[in-house]
Structure formats: structure tokens, C-alpha cells
Interface confidence: medium
């Protein structure tokens, strides 16, 4: 009679699963781009902003050729978990200025959580280890000021945008190697 309602589809084709992950990543990329533009519109950025607690970009044009699926999925999941933590922090600690970006920030968080669940499912289907590599979790302290939280938001959305952009490229490339 088939699997019970609500249970994940058992797929014998990892390419289909990868396709689904790519679609979700693309969708999240579009949302992030839109929210980053909204941020720039509402709170113009004075130059590039960085945040020490954000993960360093995992992929670059030079590394695309040597990508391996296990490494990409594991690193992507770790990085996206870090971004999820940062988005949650922004929503709670950002103060009144960032409250004006709701419900968009909330929707972004929900889609990020959905993509993370999809990546976890893909990794289990491909029998890849779920354990994330040991990385020190830098505690996210309070922003120094409201202006500081706006700068942090620019950095978080900018970093997430770049990460997702490379993730789409990397996943598409890996799909051709499956």
C-alpha cells in the first residue's frame, strides 16, 4: 500500500534528491537576495561589513574542480547551521530597527530550516556521516548598538547570499558526477 502518509519518499535516485536540494537552495538564494536588497534600501550600508562569528566561505572558483559530494554536503550543512543561528540571533537581539524586517526574516529562517532538513535527509540517503566537523561555536554576544546590529544584518545576509550562490554551483556540478 506504500509508505504511511507523512513519511519521507524513499528514493533510489540520489540525483532526484540533489535536484530537490538545488531547488530549495535556489529558492533560498532568491529570498536572501531580496531581503538583502530590502536591507540596503531601508538601512544603506556604508561599505562591506564582516562578522567574526560567521563561517568563512567554503568554495571558490579555484576549488570547484576538486569538490567531493560528502565534503560539500557536510560543510554546507555546518555553514548553514551557523547562518541559522545568526538569523535567530538577529531576530531576537536586533531591536526595534530590525523588527521592521519581519515577517521576512522569519520566513527566511523557516526556509533555511527546511533546506537543512533536506540536506540531512540527503546525507542519510547517501549514507554520509551526520556528525559535523568540530568547529568552535563562537557565542553571539549582544550587538554593541542598534547601528551595530544593522551592520551585523548586512554581514549575515551578504555572507549567506555568497554561501548559497556557491552552494548552487557546487551542487549542480556534483550532480553531473553522480
Amino acid at each position: 500500500p506504500g509508505p504511511p502518509a507523512g513519511s519521507p519518499r524513499v528514493s533510489s535516485d540520489p540525483r532526484a534528491d540533489l535536484d530537490s536540494a538545488v531547488l530549495l537552495t535556489r529558492s533560498l538564494l532568491a529570498d536572501t537576495r531580496q531581503l538583502a536588497a530590502q536591507m540596503r534600501d531601508k538601512f544603506p550600508a556604508d561599505g562591506d561589513h564582516s562578522l567574526d562569528s560567521l563561517p568563512t566561505l567554503a568554495m571558490s572558483a579555484g576549488t570547484l574542480g576538486s569538490l567531493q559530494l560528502p565534503g560539500v554536503l557536510t560543510r554546507l550543512r555546518v555553514d548553514l547551521m551557523s547562518y541559522l543561528r545568526h538569523v535567530q540571533w538577529l531576530r531576537r537581539a536586533g531591536g526595534p530597527s530590525l523588527k521592521t524586517l519581519e515577517p521576512e526574516l522569519g520566513a527566511l529562517q523557516a526556509r533555511l530550516e527546511r533546506l537543512l532538513r533536506r540536506l540531512q535527509l540527503l546525507m542519510s540517503r547517501l549514507a554520509l556521516p551526520q556528525a559535523a566537523p568540530d568547529q568552535p561555536v563562537i557565542p553571539l554576544g549582544p550587538p554593541a548598538s542598534a547601528w551595530g546590529s544593522i551592520r551585523a544584518a548586512h554581514a549575515i545576509l551578504g555572507g549567506l547570499h555568497l554561501t548559497l550562490d556557491w552552494a548552487v554551483r557546487g551542487l549542480l556540478l556534483l550532480k553531473t558526477r553522480l
Partner: antibody, heavy 117, light 110 residues
């Protein structure tokens, strides 16, 4: 040293207006969201309004919406609260408070507003 | 009627540990940070705990905050006479788009 000094309080008749000021010093005023919080005699704290660091976003408590206006002049390091159509229940000590995010880390000493005929 | 619920009073003897509770909902405590303020008689409130459980510099480690779900609590150990004050919890409320306070708890050191 961070300092917030409120002024402009006094006795006013119901229906009249009053403008409170909060002079800030010892920090970069334009980097911080600012709030007004009030406390009626013998009662608890009640949040009134907040304005974002650059002045474009404002939120108000339902009890003052449409009557009170929060504003700021970053060039003068000053926060304002314009109070119109004052009622007896607006009688309170009004505090301005600085927020780096979700908490008030510095408060002024307060200014008393008495609405009475 | 305050959005956050606190007991109106609490008491203890010097050296004792007292806990003050603060109950809210998913739109305030459940999704935002809780802060605690101390107001000594005749003075302006002062930040005591922020980000649920962090202490500003200068606040003794006898004061601690915790949060679980839609409730928070403030614990004061090694109670001293100078701790006699009103204590307020507060959080941003997403539904009201504003800050909400508890009604305050008057702490008496017996």
C-alpha cells in the same frame, strides 16, 4: 560616561500638550535606538515608545498611539516626546532609556508629568 | 494588567536564596530575550540581567537569570539588605510590536 537627562515635565491640564526632552552625552547617540518608559506614582513600569537609531522607525504603546510622537535630533544628541491630548492617566515619571538591542542599558533620572485640572 | 506575570511580592532573610518568576507567552518570552531591572526606592531602574542570563559588568554574580519556554526567573543568592527593591522582567512582544513589562515584584529582606 553615558548620561541621559530628561526635562520638560510639569503640571498640565487635561487635553493640553507637553514636550519632553532627553539630552544624551558620553556615547554616539546616532548609533542607538531610544525608548521612553513611564511609571505612574506607586505603580510599575510601562513602555511608551521607541525610535530607531536613524529616526525612521517608530513604535508606540496602544495607550499613547495617536496622541504621543517620539522624535530625535541626532545633530543635537536629543530625544523628544511630544504629548498631546493629555489625560489624568498619563501622570507619571517619564524616563528615557538607551538600547543597544533588546535591553535598556542606561536610563535617565526621570521627569515628572502631572496631568490635573 | 501586565502582559508578563510576576508575583507582587517576595521575601527572604539575609544569606537566603530567593527566586522571582516571570510568565509570558510565545510572542514575548518564547521568541525574544528576557531582561531584568532592579529599581531601588526613589531611583531610576537599573539593568540587572539581559539576554536571558547575562550580567552587565558591576552586577554581582549573586544575581542570575534563566529561561525555559515562555517563563523566566531571576534568582538572588546570599540575600543582602541592599537587595530590597522592586524587580521587573521585560521582553519585546512580536504581536504588540513593543516592549512589555511584568507588574514588578517587591522584594523584602526580613
Amino acid at each position: 560616561e553615558v548620561q541621559l537627562v530628561e526635562s520638560g515635565g510639569g503640571v498640565v491640564q487635561p487635553g493640553r500638550s507637553l514636550r519632553l526632552s532627553c539630552a544624551a552625552s558620553g556615547f554616539t547617540f546616532s548609533h542607538y535606538d531610544m525608548h521612553w518608559v513611564r511609571q505612574a506614582p506607586g505603580k510599575g513600569l510601562e513602555w511608551v515608545a521607541v525610535i530607531s537609531y536613524e529616526g525612521s522607525n517608530k513604535f508606540y504603546a496602544d495607550s499613547v498611539k495617536g496622541r504621543f510622537t517620539i522624535s530625535r535630533d541626532n545633530s543635537k544628541n536629543t530625544l523628544y516626546l511630544q504629548m498631546n491630548s493629555l489625560r489624568a492617566e498619563d501622570t507619571a515619571v517619564y524616563y528615557c532609556a538607551r538600547t543597544p538591542g533588546s535591553h535598556f542599558d542606561y536610563w535617565g533620572q526621570g521627569t515628572l508629568v502631572t496631568v490635573s485640572s | 494588567q501586565s502582559v508578563l506575570t510576576q508575583p507582587p511580592s517576595a521575601s527572604g532573610t539575609p544569606g537566603q536564596r530567593v527566586t522571582i518568576s516571570c510568565s509570558g507567552s510565545s510572542s514575548n518570552i518564547g521568541s525574544n530575550y528576557v531582561n531584568w531591572y532592579q529599581q531601588l526606592p526613589g531611583t531610576a531602574p537599573k539593568l540587572l540581567i539581559y539576554y536571558d542570563d547575562l550580567r552587565p559588568s558591576g552586577v554581582p554574580d549573586r544575581f542570575s537569570g534563566s529561561k525555559s519556554g515562555t517563563s523566566a526567573s531571576l534568582a538572588i543568592s546570599g540575600l543582602r539588605s541592599e537587595d530590597e527593591a522592586d524587580y521587573y522582567c521585560a521582553a519585546w512582544d512580536d504581536s504588540l510590536s513593543g516592549v512589555v513589562f511584568g507588574g514588578g515584584t517587591k522584594l523584602t529582606v526580613l
